[in-house]
Amino acid sequence: GSERTCCPVNWVEHERSCYWFSRSGKAWADADNYCRLEDAHLVVVTSWEEQKFVQHHIGPVNTWMGLHDQNGPWKWVDGTDYETGFKNWRPEQPDDWYGHGLGGGEDCAHFTDDGRWNDDVCQRPYRWVCETELDKASQEPPLL
């Protein structure tokens, strides 16, 4: 495939990545799938600078990111290492609360109204942010 050199329509470019900000809500798995169908992934926050950029665009609204612990340890959807990477959890989070009776914990991470992160029940219909890297080869065949 060819390298993507500019962001798709309605996506916002920032630091060699493209971001798309939803204006409706979906459960985490549905949001994850939406981004994948756009040849992207749920946003992976790797720096304080990126955190501030995303926070500016989403405002004080609960919003899914590409971080989950549905299979045990916390993982970023693009494989970025969680342990050594940037984190911005609320105090006392993540707590993986099991008390809601869902037969599982709070396995999906989201930006809260103040931008800090919380883990929550993955079924909540929060807004979401997709991200794709400009330098990534797109899946479209090159123009002949």
Epitope: G25, D95, G99, G101, E106, Q123
Partner: antibody, heavy 126, light 107 residues
């Protein structure tokens, strides 16, 4: 048994604030959301927002953003809804309702507002 | 926001009748829909969740169907205690929203 008991009726002047309480019993307070829903006389149901005392998360309908604050006191299993800058159109019965997610076969899910308070009448009049 | 509409807004029926109420969402909501019954001066009561699943303790004469944007609540063999207002409610997206209600009264 599981129940939500709300505070008594309030009469307020325009511009004032009102704080309605909702005391939960018969279940683990932190295991569920509390939703707030209001109903003007002869009108339908209007969802105002939700709060979760465990994750300390809240979500408000845009219409009430900036005017509503939902809080809680886990030690007494009580949720609160405060509405400020009251106007006559805020005259309504305000309900709290317990909410929670549950899983269905096939990894589907639903959200259940299964237990409601008795309602608190708020009258805004000069 | 997702708009919910209901029809009819009111209907008159007799004891023993079969009643059907429809609810339409302004966009697809899968099966993330509930139905509530409300009697005058009382809090709403949950009847149906996930469009078609009956809440425990609710008689089987109530049934729900539909997916996407169009949903139906059916009450078989209407009894005096069923005369009330019925609301549909979507929890597919925030803000959660309710339909305007359908009032079922005695003919």
């Amino acid at each position: 048994q599981v129940q939500l008991v709300q505070s008594g009726a309030e009469v307020k002047k325009p511009g004032a604030s009102v704080k309605v309480s909702c005391k939960a019993s018969g279940y683990t307070f932190t295991s569920y959301d509390i939703n707030w829903v209001r109903q003007a006389t002869g009108q339908g149901l209007e969802w105002m927002g939700w709060m979760n005392p465990n994750s300390r998360n809240t979500g408000y309908a845009q219409k009430f953003q900036g005017r509503v604050t939902m809080t809680w006191n886990t030690s007494i299993s009580t949720a609160y809804m405060e509405l400020s800058s009251l106007r006559s159109e805020d005259t309504a019965v305000y309900y709290c309702a317990r909410g929670g997610y549950d899983v269905l076969p096939g990894n589907n899910y639903y959200y259940d507002m299964d237990v409601w308070g008795q309602g608190t009448t708020v009258t805004v009049s000069s | 926001d997702i708009q919910m509409t209901q029809s009819p807004s009111s209907l008159s029926a007799s004891v023993g009748d079969r009643v059907t109420i429809t609810c339409r969402a302004s966009q697809g909501i899968s099966n993330y829909l509930a139905w509530f019954q409300q009697k005058p001066g009382k809090a709403p009561k949950s009847l149906i969740y996930a469009a078609s699943s009956l809440q425990s303790g609710v008689p089987s004469k109530f049934s729900g169907s539909g997916s996407g944007t169009d949903f139906t609540l059916t009450i078989n063999s209407l009894q005096p205690e069923d005369f009330a207002t019925y609301y549909c409610h979507q929890y597919n997206d925030y803000p959660f929203t309710f339909g305007p209600g359908t009032k079922v009264d005695i003919k």
